[in-house]
């Protein structure tokens, strides 16, 4: 797994709604696959971690300054939707196709 | 100045381009305010730092499991332009007004 | 090598029209904004006109002295600008120059050519 | 319309020695954190000739004893050591709106 001196990656992270107390609204499925950004943007950033002009600037600031700047940090910059089944206001279990936001599809350092 | 303790903010970081070595093609400004995102994304996630649910799930997670996944992180979510006056492949000083994404203009929990 | 070749000017008589030309080299001419600039006998220098580029729609801008009388122009193609001054003055004698540049600077600069008004 | 004034209109400085032209603009002429101010020296029967612009940068070739500083409405053109071939007119021009402007000019000359 990605640790702290790893560069910027998407790894796993099974979340269980049970866990987060969202079982309570969420019948199925009972876990997913989140994924997790993970590990460090570190100079020279890579074309992969997709990094905007101003997370070139702070990396840069970081090199010649580090303990007065951060460094830019590994998120998620896409994320993909997942398909719940849920119990709606009359408590009718609904299939949401789209629940977006829910899964990492992309990670990238910002 | 927003900390490690502070929530996640926007706070100042005036950037020299001597500094980040692109002053050999930024002629002006000399430095610009690139502003940077610090601070923690605690739970409850406020409206304001404009949590995506994949970052909600992911404080969630972390507040069961921290030492197995970390905080959602404090990062630009919206970048503004600045003007600069650099040299083209001719050496002819040249205004680019909208130079994208070099300066935060919002900050947020990803 | 960077030229800015302004054509032949002359004696004109009040009222009159002229056409300047400048052909342009050593740079690509469509990269660029082009400009007159003129000087009268023992004076300042005085911006006439400018065209930006095919981007900006060929937008063209005119000193105040000249606007409605004077049209610029460009052809890309021809690596040329031009300048058409109607209704001439005796006040728009002077040499005129061909420049080059971006939207900052006057960069490139033609060796002028001179326009006498007179009757 | 921004308006450039020059001063001295004319200037005798000694070779070797320091010549300093003003250029007062009638606004400022800085904007985005960057000087629209530009100077020109033209010589007899040329052309003028890009020497400093953004207010203190020197042109292509331009030689090291012409230096030029200021922001905001005040901008000065120093040429050290005054040689021979400095002789010439100087003007200040201004980019920051259309019409681009320049100021009247300064005549310089060896004393």
């Known amino acids: 797994s990605a640790g702290a001196g790893s560069h910027c990656q998407k790894t796993s992270l099974r979340v269980n709604f049970e866990d987060i107390g969202w079982d309570s609204w969420i019948i199925a499925p009972k876990e997913y696959e989140a994924y997790e950004c993970k590990g460090g943007c570190f100079f020279p950033l890579a074309d992969d971690v997709t990094p905007t002009k101003h997370a070139i600037v702070q990396t840069l600031v970081h090199l010649k300054f580090p303990t007065k700047v951060g460094k830019a940090c590994c998120v998620p910059t896409k994320l993909s939707p997942i398909s719940v089944l849920y119990k709606d206001d009359m408590g009718v279990p609904t299939l949401k196709y789209h629940y977006e936001g829910m899964s990492v599809a992309e990670c990238g350092c910002r | 100045s927003a900390g490690a303790g502070s929530h996640c903010q926007k706070t100042s970081l005036r950037v020299n381009f001597e500094d980040i070595g692109w002053d050999s093609w930024i002629i002006a400004p000399k430095e610009y305010e690139a502003y940077e995102c610090k601070g923690g994304c605690f739970f409850p996630l406020a409206d304001d730092v404009t949590p995506t649910k994949h970052a909600i799930v992911q404080t969630l997670v972390h507040l069961k499991f921290p030492t197995k996944v970390g905080k959602a992180c404090c990062v630009p979510t919206k970048l503004s332009p600045i003007s600069v006056l650099y040299k083209d492949d001719m050496g002819v000083p040249t205004l680019k007004y909208h130079y994208e994404g070099m300066s935060v203009a919002e900050c947020g929990c990803r | 090598e960077v030229q800015l070749v302004e054509s032949r000017g002359g004696l004109v008589q009040p009222g009159g029209s002229m056409r300047l030309s400048c052909a342009a080299s050593?740079?690509?001419?469509?990269?660029?904004?082009m400009n007159w600039v003129r000087q009268a006998p023992g004076k300042g220098l005085e911006w006439v006109a400018h065209?930006?580029?095919?981007?900006?729609?060929?937008?063209?801008h005119y000193a105040e002295s000249v606007r409605g009388r004077f049209t610029i122009s460009r052809d890309d193609s021809k690596s040329s600008v031009y300048l058409q001054m109607n209704s001439l003055k005796t006040e728009d004698t002077g040499i005129y120059y061909c420049?080059?540049?971006?939207?900052?600077?006057?960069?490139?600069w033609g060796q002028g050519t001179l326009v006498t008004v007179s009757s | 319309d921004i308006v450039l004034t020059q001063s001295p209109d004319s200037l005798a400085v000694s070779l070797g020695e320091r010549a300093t032209i003003n250029c007062r603009a009638s606004e400022s002429v800085d904007n985005y954190g960057i000087s629209f101010m530009n100077w020109f020296q033209q010589k007899p029967g040329q052309p003028p000739k890009l020497l400093i612009y953004a207010a203190s940068n020197q042109g292509s070739g331009v030689p090291d004893r012409f230096s030029g500083s200021g922001s905001g409405t005040d901008f000065t053109l120093t040429i050290s050591p005054m040689q021979a071939e400095d002789v010439a007119m100087y003007f200040c021009?201004?980019?920051?709106?259309?019409?681009?402007?320049f100021g009247q000019g300064t005549k310089l000359e060896i004393k």
């Open positions: 420049t080059g540049g971006s939207n900052y600077v006057f960069a490139f």
């Open positions: 021009q201004q980019s920051k709106e259309v019409p681009w402007t």
């Open positions: 050593g740079f690509t001419f469509s990269n660029y904004w």
């Open positions: 065209i930006r580029l095919k981007s900006d729609n060929y937008a063209t």
